[in-house]
Interface confidence: low
């Protein structure tokens, strides 16, 4: 039978089963979210993409699943991150009590899959799914982390923080999910503040990248919200991780502030 | 006292692909970035990018990027520099080079280099 | 990118006299007070070895004949007096800006 080709690569293989598995996982160790039954979950999750037309995919598809997996995050606790994923998910595994998207059980369950179906059949495309660049931004996996980031901006509170990557050109990027979705959704009247750690990602001079012109930019958008804006450097991520792993280590000096600079707007 | 120790010379074809290590020793690892530098015949040298082999950051020169990754083992503490769809003019020697430390972005060790020679 | 122009491209010296090679870097590379550029010496078949850092600031093991001076755009690098084994390829390298970059060279030889 014919079948559209994408650009993009094809769904995840084992897709159901991983997704199943991760709930069950995620509800087991985390027992605010026991409650939750896995099958409904893969049901939900299911019912916003199969039988679509992957470029078709919009946030009201993720609706049901949105529902089940309803979470909040304590205020001051919640860490933003943007193209530097891998750092912001080892900080929240020592720092137990902050928490990425990622964290969450929907973005546990989604966390690097990929995932597809087809127009008017009962399959999932395990060959190609739309690429965002080259088919469509609104295919299932785009339109899933955008609903999802939303959600997780808008029930933010108390000082947000965001981990940005220092070594891009472009460190804060507007085209970013960061950038263009959780920006904007962070909610005046409960998030007094916004942190950015910008991480040096083991550069060795000693550039305030926090004077960066997307800085700036960034700093101008929060503000015009009437959101208080910070800027912190990380000049040495190793060693910030290694002083949240082990404040008393007598090179950290006072907790993490020995790995970087505090720069208030 | 520290060290660095490329891979031999490399006879490649224009269009193929080559990977050159940089092996590190006398020093933390995962503690420094490891950058690349390219001397090709009659030219300047060239900052190829680096990697912060504590995190696997990368940094590159936009003229590199592309064509140039790198990546390395921290196990084995080694860098290496793959770069792909060769053609003449990348026929240099290639230098990994390492800095004295955070802020002191200039180049204090240097591997003795590698020659690769693009020739069909 | 930054660009930086050295002079001259040769120089011909004797043993005993005073060489001054100049960097030029088509915007300024100051910053936190320092002047981020760097001088390495080159001889044929061996890596580049650093001499000066941080505009002049002598890097370890360098012999007090080698100074560095400047700031902004325009810095020397001077040798006096010559010894033989200090004919060579001289490069000044800033980073101040990714991409970190080099000048062209300044061959030292032997008059």
């Known amino acids: 039978r014919w079948r559209q080709q994408w650009s993009g690569s094809g769904t995840t293989s084992r897709f159901p089963e991983t997704v199943l598995a991760r709930c069950v996982k995620y509800t087991e160790v985390h027992p605010e979210m026991r409650h939750v039954d896995c099958q409904s979950v893969w049901d939900a999750f299911k019912g916003a993409f199969i039988s679509k037309y992957p470029c078709n995919i919009t946030e009201e598809d993720y609706q049901p699943l949105v529902k089940l997996g309803t979470q909040t995050v304590p205020c001051n606790k919640t860490l933003l991150w943007s193209r530097i994923k891998d750092l912001a998910h080892q900080f929240t595994q020592v720092q137990r009590d902050m928490f990425t998207l990622e964290d969450m059980l929907l973005g546990y369950l989604a966390d690097d899959l990929t995932w597809c179906g087809e127009f008017n059949t009962f399959e999932i495309n395990y060959q190609s799914c739309p690429d965002w660049r080259k088919d469509c931004s609104n295919n299932p996996v785009s339109v899933f982390w955008k609903t999802v980031s939303r959600r997780f901006a808008e029930t933010a509170c108390g000082v947000v923080h965001v981990m940005l990557n220092g070594s891009r050109s472009k460190i804060f990027d507007k085209n970013s999910t960061f950038g263009s979705v959780e920006v904007h959704n962070l909610q005046p009247e409960k998030v007094q503040a916004l942190e950015a750690w910008v991480i040096h990602g083991g550069r060795e001079d000693s550039r305030d990248l926090c004077q960066d012109p997307t800085i700036k930019e960034l700093e101008s958008i929060i503000s015009k919200r009437n959101i208080r804006f910070f800027c912190k450097n990380i000049y040495r991520p190793d060693k910030f991780l290694q002083c949240v792993k082990n404040p008393e280590d007598s090179s950290c000096l006072s907790g993490i502030s020995a790995s970087h600079h505090h720069h208030h707007h | 006292q520290v060290q660095l120790v490329q891979s031999g010379a490399e006879v490649v074809k224009p269009g193929a692909s080559v990977k050159m290590s940089c092996k590190a020793s006398g020093y933390t690892f995962t503690s420094f970035n490891m950058h690349w530098v390219k001397e090709a015949p009659g030219q300047r040298l060239e900052w190829i990018g680096y990697i912060y082999p504590g995190n696997g950051g990368t940094n590159y020169n936009q003229k590199f990027q592309g064509r140039a990754t790198l990546t390395a083992d921290t196990s084995a503490s080694t860098a290496y520099m793959e770069i792909s769809s060769l053609r003449s003019e990348d026929t240099a020697v290639y230098f990994c080079a390492r800095t004295g430390g955070l802020r002191r972005a200039y180049f204090t060790y240097w591997g003795q280099g590698t020659l690769v020679t693009v020739s069909s | 990118d930054i660009v930086l122009t050295q002079s001259p491209a040769t120089l011909s010296l004797s043993p005993g006299e005073r060489a001054t090679i100049s960097c030029r870097a088509s915007e300024s590379v100051d910053s936190y007070g320092n002047g981020f550029m760097h001088w390495y010496q080159q001889k044929p078949g061996q890596p580049p070895r650093l001499l000066i850092y941080?505009?002049?600031s002598r890097a370890t093991g360098i012999p007090a004949r080698f100074s560095g001076s400047g700031s902004g755009t325009d810095f020397t690098l001077t040798i006096s007096p010559l010894e033989p084994e200090d004919f060579a390829v001289y490069y000044c390298q800033q980073n101040k800006e990714d991409p970190w970059t080099f000048g062209g060279g300044t061959k030292l030889e032997i008059k």
């Open positions: 941080l505009a002049s």
